[in-house]
């Protein structure tokens, strides 16, 4: 009844304030879109996030909201504005009938509207606690002290702040935005309400079992006593953090989001904005034994997304489900039977499992790294997390076959020293989404804003592809792969590196149509070759042609099939030196690899020739991998000959700068 009165009050105000003179027609040619969660049970119809165009001011947001209310009232509908967003995303949260969506989409400034949906704690079963004796043996795990310069925000359930693990380390903010618990007979028990958040706070910064014992934390309550929240509540929480950051700028900020919901454009957009404001966001990949790209905030590229492994480096199984996987996961971390603070008593401990626990580990490691090097950018931190991870230790057989190549085989680890690795040239591999099977389908892989795209390759499980090319898009290079007729689709694979003061460009040679093959080199003074790509318009390059090998003494040259256009990535950066390494075999083989020596970093990976039995090339850590069709389907003719071409670089400039600092 109280709520209805509130609605009526707002409705009257809206009617009074609406003036026809304020009416602004939506811009022509731009249509706002409607989005909702793909997982039906998680939908929350009746509540909508109306996202306005980027430049929209707060006053315009308020005016648009009032306008919606007035126009709805004229049609006899009650609406309630629950929140007006500003600081992170312009827009508002409105409670209204779905009948009004068409009207709302036509309002001025509207970019898109998203129906609210649920998000969930990612520990399973996080409330079925296995209590360990209160006198927990602290000597079992002694992580290094650290993280004292960093503040970690935890968006989770309520927490038991007087638990001895976290007492004095966690500040409980007054932020709370949670949905009602499900079920009429739900009994709120403090220890259950606090269970998930308390455990995670302990994993991040607990006295005995914490990763970053020096880190201070702030908790925001966005999950209810059943571990359930909403996208809108999470958005308002992220906005709260941004406003806090603006009011009182502190040192580095890490935001831990140990929750997941269905794919959400608006939640991903909010994460992107916060990340671009210098905040490091770490999230759970999700516990659905599924592609992490189908969930948010796990699918947001700017967020560090963490899957879970166990003590045997196996992906974590959780009942019939388990850790998510795929290209949207950045790395894995321990997430099974993790000992941490239990909300059952102030000295109790419990083990919990899930990608929430894995994400908490990485948030702790991030806090340690940022405390040692507070100036690290998000891109630098992510590259370091990848660099210091244990490589290729996860048994990939657990993942679906089509996801194995896309899922990073990395388990997070603390760096051996807190002095960082400033001398290192850091690179990572970024896979695109699958292109789809249509003839002209393409896939695009992008690097983060402050990374350089140093090379581009492609991969197709059927082998039917038309190569790849680097091209400019919005002032930045992207990697685009092309599907071929009859192909099941392609992936683009970008090699993204941290290269300060770099000036990179792409040099292209059209198909040569000569028996020598196509060649292109870096002709500008001081520019070195960091990657080679090839792209062809013909459906099949022809399998009878032998691979074209690079002439000796021409290290700055890309070579390829005569019917392909060849693209060379050429970069100038202080002290950058690169060399080409080739490994060719005369007989057919499913996999050919070549790796860079210690101290060198793989920047480019490509295959010669680009013929259809070659599925593609991609970089795994410092190894260039070329995959070909199953040996049994390829005769042992020269058709089987394949060469893996790696370009290995290092930066003398970075090495010198690092030595000067020591």
């Amino acid at each position: 009844q109280e709520d209805e009165d509130g609605d009526y009050e707002e409705l009257v105000l809206a009617l009074r304030s609406e003036e026809d003179g304020l009416a602004e027609a939506p811009e022509h040619g731009t249509t706002a879109t409607f989005h909702r969660c793909a997982k039906d049970p998680w939908r929350l119809p009746g509540t909508y996030v109306v996202v306005l165009k980027e430049e929209t001011h707060l006053s315009q947001s308020e005016r648009t909201a009032r306008r919606l209310q007035a126009q709805a009232a004229r049609r006899g509908y009650l609406t309630k504005i629950l929140h007006v967003f500003h600081g992170l995303l312009p827009g508002f949260l409105v409670k209204m009938s779905g009948d009004l969506l068409e009207l709302a989409l036509k309002l001025p400034h509207v970019d898109y509207i998203e129906e609210d949906s649920s998000v969930f704690a990612q520990s399973i079963p996080w409330n079925l606690e296995r209590i360990t004796p209160p006198r927990y043996r602290a000597d079992e795990y002694q992580p290094p002290d650290g993280g004292s310069l960093v503040e970690v925000y935890l968006l989770d359930t309520s927490i038991q702040s007087d638990h001895r693990e976290i007492e004095g380390r966690v500040m409980v903010t007054d932020f709370e935005n949670v949905p009602e618990e499900d079920g009429t007979r739900f009994h709120r028990q403090a220890s259950k309400c606090d269970s998930h958040g308390t455990h995670l706070a302990g994993v991040v910064s607990g006295r005995d079992a914490g990763v970053a014992k020096g880190a201070s934390m702030r908790s925001l309550r966005v999950l209810n006593c059943q571990g359930k929240g909403t996208v809108s509540g999470t958005l308002i929480g992220l906005e709260f953090i941004r406003k806090s950051q603006l009011v009182q700028p502190v040192g580095p900020l890490v935001v831990l989001l140990p929750l997941a919901g269905g794919y959400s454009r608006v939640l991903n957009a909010a994460c992107q904005r916060l990340a671009r404001a210098g905040v490091v966001l770490v999230t759970a990949a999700g516990n659905f034994r599924d592609d992490a790209c189908l969930y948010s905030p796990a699918s947001a590229p700017e967020v560090i997304t963490v899957g879970a492994t166990n003590a045997q480096d196996q992906p974590v199984t959780l009942g019939t489900l388990g850790t998510n996987f795929g290209r949207c996961v950045d790395l894995f971390a321990p997430g099974e039977d993790i000992i941490g603070a239990s909300s059952d008593c102030s000295t109790c401990f419990v083990s919990q499992s899930g990608t929430s626990q894995a994400a908490a580990h990485v948030a702790g490691i991030a806090a340690m790294m940022l405390s040692a090097e507070p100036e690290l950018t998000l891109a630098e931190l992510r590259q370091r997390l990848i660099h210091f991870s244990a490589k290729d230790v996860i048994n990939e057989a657990w993942f679906p076959e089509d996801q194995r190549v896309l899922t990073p085989n990395l388990v997070a680890a603390l760096p051996p020293s807190t002095h960082g690795a400033g001398w290192q040239l850091f690179c990572r591999t970024v896979w695109s989404a699958h292109s789809g099977p249509t003839r002209m389908a393409t896939a695009v892989a992008r690097c983060a804003p402050d990374e350089e795209l140093l090379s581009c390759s492609s991969f197709s499980r059927s082998g039917k592809r038309r190569g790849e090319r680097m091209e400019a898009q919005g002032g930045k290079l992207v990697c685009r792969a092309h599907n071929a007729f009859g192909g099941e689709g392609v992936y683009a694979i970008a090699r993204c590196c941290l290269l300060p003061q770099a000036n990179c460009s792409v040099h292209t040679a059209p198909p040569a149509e000569a028996s020598m093959g196509t060649r292109v080199h870096c002709h500008q003074q001081g520019h070195v070759l960091t990657g080679c790509s090839s792209h062809w318009e013909v459906e099949d390059l022809g399998t009878h042609k032998p691979p074209v090998l690079r002439p000796r003494g021409q290290p700055n040259q890309c070579v390829g099939h005569r019917e392909a256009s060849i693209h060379a990535s050429c970069c100038h950066a202080p002290g950058l030196e690169c060399k080409v390494k080739e490994h060719g075999i005369p007989a057919p083989q499913e996999q050919v690899t070549v790796a860079c020596e210690e101290g060198w970093t793989l920047t480019g990976c490509s295959a010669l020739p680009g013929t259809s039995h070659v599925l593609g090339a991609y970089a795994v850590d410092n190894t260039c991998v070329v995959r070909s069709r199953d040996v049994s389907t390829t005769g042992s003719t020269s058709e089987g000959a394949v060469t893996a071409v790696a370009i290995c670089c290092r930066s003398r400039h970075l090495a010198q700068a690092s030595q000067e600092l020591q």
């Epitope: 050919v592 690899t593 070549v594 790796a595 020596e597 210690e598 795994v620 991998v625």
Partner: nanobody, 123 residues
Amino acid sequence: QVKLEESGGGLVQAGGSLRLSCAASGLTFSNYAMGWFRQAPGTEREFVGQISQVDGFTYYEDSVKGRFTISRDNAKNTVYLQMNSLKPDDTAVYYCAAALAFPTTSSNTYAYSGQGTQVTVSS
């Protein structure tokens, strides 16, 4: 200081099995394809098999295919050679080696090699 240390060799009867291990230190183990070679008295060093850096792809010399299996544990920086259905012809010193490329059968393409472990198969 790179070190490759083989173990697990010994005397075994024909038809028997043996598992050799090779523990690596001083290198970025996951960066290297790991191979096994063997050398019988008075003969050249012979390629046995190799496991790649990525996805555990393997490549074997024809005479050991189906009998020998190479595996690796990157968490332990160790590579293994499981030898089944051993024959007297398999008697040799077995060496583990690290290469930056896969597949490669020539010992001079390997950057590092161990001291070897003796395997003797009696008839």
